[in-house]
């Protein structure tokens, strides 16, 4: 008998998702309108290209990056798309309600879509830690909670610490990583006997994961520069991110070979380590004054990523139940922290140069900001994890973890597994 989506979930998912979509449509109907004031059509196209880059990163990059499981590749890609589509809608509304609602309706601009795509990207980073262990109904909950938590975090940081769009969005790496790890910690961990093969990677899915990594690698400069307000800052961000990811690729491949007794290169190490530099320079990409610094940062990030990929999976698998190939969570947590530390170092250098305590106070504020991001990520992640454990979601049985057949119709399969 072929695997079927549990009957209760068949009732639950369409009802839950379509009700939510109907609610979103109503909210858009009553509370939003387009920015009809654009004068320059060329400017529109240029502005849209940034948003397009972000969408490619999210849909293709992160979608395929998480698709390396032997029997869960189709779900990884499609569930990512589902979460992105839902997350962007909710993020646009939430950002509008939090930032401009008192003045009347929420005005939708290309910039708000850009912000929303970046917010939704947070979910796609986090979900790497739980993909294969949850169904779509649970992922809907995760999208709603995480986008809401990130939106509120950004608003609080913006108001209390007075950071601009770029700085408060760059907490996304640390936030998404810790959110995902804390959700994973709440979910049932041990894989039952006989299913160990399902969370292993396979050649074709690994190739598509590499494709995802390549798309992310190509578009990471767009991500890091998307929210900067002046051309000089954007230019610096693009250059520094490019240098950093270029060096992290070289480091990832050579470091992976170095880490293997026979000098072989691990696909899993390379998938994540090629992105290391982009994550590490994120916060300070527009501030790094020269290419060699960005390159050194890319080198350090690549080494940390490969080192993490070698030594952390064992711990993560035992404690959090995260499979060896899902290394984005701890990778981003380490590299996001590195990026934040680099920014704090730049603040400290300013303190030394200025010779007054004012910027020292700024260092404390930045540490407070980072701490707040981590605390909110952990708390909202734990809340999400607890919600996902509720019986109403009809989570897949542990024996059916990492299995496309639980969710998808495969006409060529006459029988189950």
């Amino acid at each position: 008998m072929s695997s079927k989506y549990p009957r209760s979930v068949r009732r639950c998912l369409p009802l839950w998702a379509l009700t939510l979509e109907a609610a979103l449509i109503l909210l858009f109907y009553f509370f939003t309108h387009y920015d009809a004031s654009l004068e320059d059509q060329k400017g529109l196209v240029a502005s849209y290209q940034v948003g397009q880059d972000l969408t490619v990163m999210a849909a293709i990059g992160l979608g395929f990056l998480t698709s390396s499981f032997r029997r869960h590749s189709w779900s990884s890609v499609a569930f990512n798309l589902f979460m992105l589509a839902l997350g962007v809608q909710w993020a646009i509304l939430l950002d509008g309600f939090l930032s401009q609602f008192p003045s009347g309706k929420v005005v939708i601009t290309l910039f708000s879509i850009r912000l929303a795509t970046m917010s939704a990207l947070s979910v796609l980073i986090s979900v790497d830690a739980v993909l294969g262990k949850v169904n779509l109904a649970q992922l809907v909950v995760m999208v709603l909670v995480e986008v809401t938590a990130l939106g509120n975090l950004r608003m609080v940081i913006s108001n209390i610490f007075n950071t601009d769009y770029h700085m408060n969005m760059m907490h996304i790496y640390v936030f998404a990583a810790y959110f995902g790890l804390s959700v994973a910690w709440c979910l049932p961990k041990p894989l039952p006997e006989g299913t160990e093969d399902k969370d292993q990677t396979a050649t074709i899915p690994s190739l598509s994961a590499m494709l995802g990594a390549l798309f992310l690698w190509m578009f990471w400069p767009s991500f890091n520069s998307a929210l900067l307000r002046s051309p000089i800052e954007r230019k610096n961000a693009v250059f520094n991110t490019y240098y950093a990811v270029a060096v992290s690729v070289v480091t990832a491949i050579s470091g992976s070979s170095l880490a293997h007794p026979q000098g072989k290169i691990s696909k899993t190490y390379v998938h994540s380590a090629v992105l290391a530099g982009g994550v590490a320079v994120g916060t300070s990409c527009h501030l790094i004054p020269s290419p060699w610094l960005a390159m050194v940062l890319g080198l350090v990030a690549g080494l940390i990523s490969v080192g993490g990929a070698k030594y952390l999976p064992g711990c993560c698998n035992r404690v959090l139940g995260i499979p060896h190939s899902s290394i984005m969570g701890y990778n981003f947590s380490l590299l996001g922290l590195l990026g934040e530390i680099i920014y704090i170092v730049l603040l400290v250098l300013d303190t030394v140069g200025a010779g007054n305590g004012m910027i020292g106070f700024q260092v404390l504020l930045s540490i407070g900001e980072l701490s707040l991001a981590i605390v909110i990520a952990l708390m909202s992640g734990l809340l999400t994890g607890l919600l996902l454990n509720l019986k109403i979601w009809k989570a897949p049985h542990e024996a059916k973890y990492f299995d496309d057949q639980v969710f998808w119709k495969f006409p060529h399969l006459a029988v189950g597994f």
Epitope: L38, E39, D40, G43, L44, A46, S47, V50, T109, L110, F111, R114, N162, D164, Y165, R229, S230, P231, I232, E233, S284, H286, L287, P289, Y343, L346, L347, L349, D350, G353, A354, M358, I359, F361, Q362
Partner: antibody, heavy 126, light 106 residues
């Protein structure tokens, strides 16, 4: 020569609309954020609105939010301010100003308005 | 909120003039100073608290960081009689100006 020239001011009744323009020349217009700043008769300067260099993001003072719209056409090197539901308190000289950024130390940028237009007068009177 | 003091002052040519600007909370060194003559547009004098804008005479100088800032004119010239405004660029998007200080001939 770097220059900003405002136009479109005039006398209008409360509740009516007006559209101000600011023509830029002598510099790369699409590389700078642009501001509108106003000055009521005998009063100080009040910032009104700001638009990013690529037009993708806009900010407004609370006093004009929902009524004024800042836009730009980089192909025409022109900045606009669409003013709707005008009130008596909107009477002022309106200046457009270019924003320039400079790097400060290692960890930040400072932004300032380094080029200003001559201003255009808007009078709201019944 | 940016508070300038004094709101007006009278001085003679050659005098050393000091205008202060206080922010309600720290703005680091994100403070700019402008000069405005009657019927004219404002003109940038100092940016980032202490950097002199190109073409501005060296008798103008700025100092301060955090919440307290000062504009100093070391030797007042006839063309310096005008109104001076401070403006913070730290708390975007609210680019607030001080209420202005009018420098008059004694």
């Amino acid at each position: 020569q770097v220059k900003l020239l405002e136009s479109g001011g005039g006398v209008v009744q409360p509740g009516k609309s007006l559209r101000l323009s600011c023509a830029a020349s002598g510099f790369s217009f699409n590389s700078h954020g642009m501001h509108w700043v106003r000055q009521a008769p005998g009063k100080g300067l009040e910032w009104v609105a700001f638009i990013w260099f690529d037009g993708s993001n806009k900010y407004y003072a609370d006093s004009v939010k929902g009524r004024f719209t800042i836009t730009r056409d980089n192909s025409k090197n022109t900045l606009y301010l669409q003013m709707n539901s005008l009130r008596a308190e909107d009477t002022a000289v309106y200046y457009c100003a270019r924003e320039t950024s400079v790097r400060l130390g290692y960890s930040r940028y400072n932004y300032y308005m380094d080029v200003w237009g001559k201003g255009t007068t808007v009078t709201i009177s019944s | 909120v940016m508070t300038q003091s004094p709101s007006s002052l009278s001085a003679s040519v050659g005098d050393r003039v000091t205008i202060t600007c206080r922010a309600s909370q720290s703005i680091r060194s994100h403070l700019n100073w402008y000069q405005q003559k009657p019927g004219k547009a404002p003109k940038l004098l100092i940016y980032a608290a202490s950097s002199l804008q190109g073409g501005v005479p060296s008798r103008f100088s700025g100092s301060g960081s955090g919440t307290d800032f000062t504009l100093t004119i070391s030797s007042l010239q006839p063309e310096d009689f005008a109104t001076y405004y401070c403006q913070q660029s730290y708390r975007a998007p609210q680019w607030t100006f001080g209420q202005g200080t009018k420098v008059e001939i004694k």
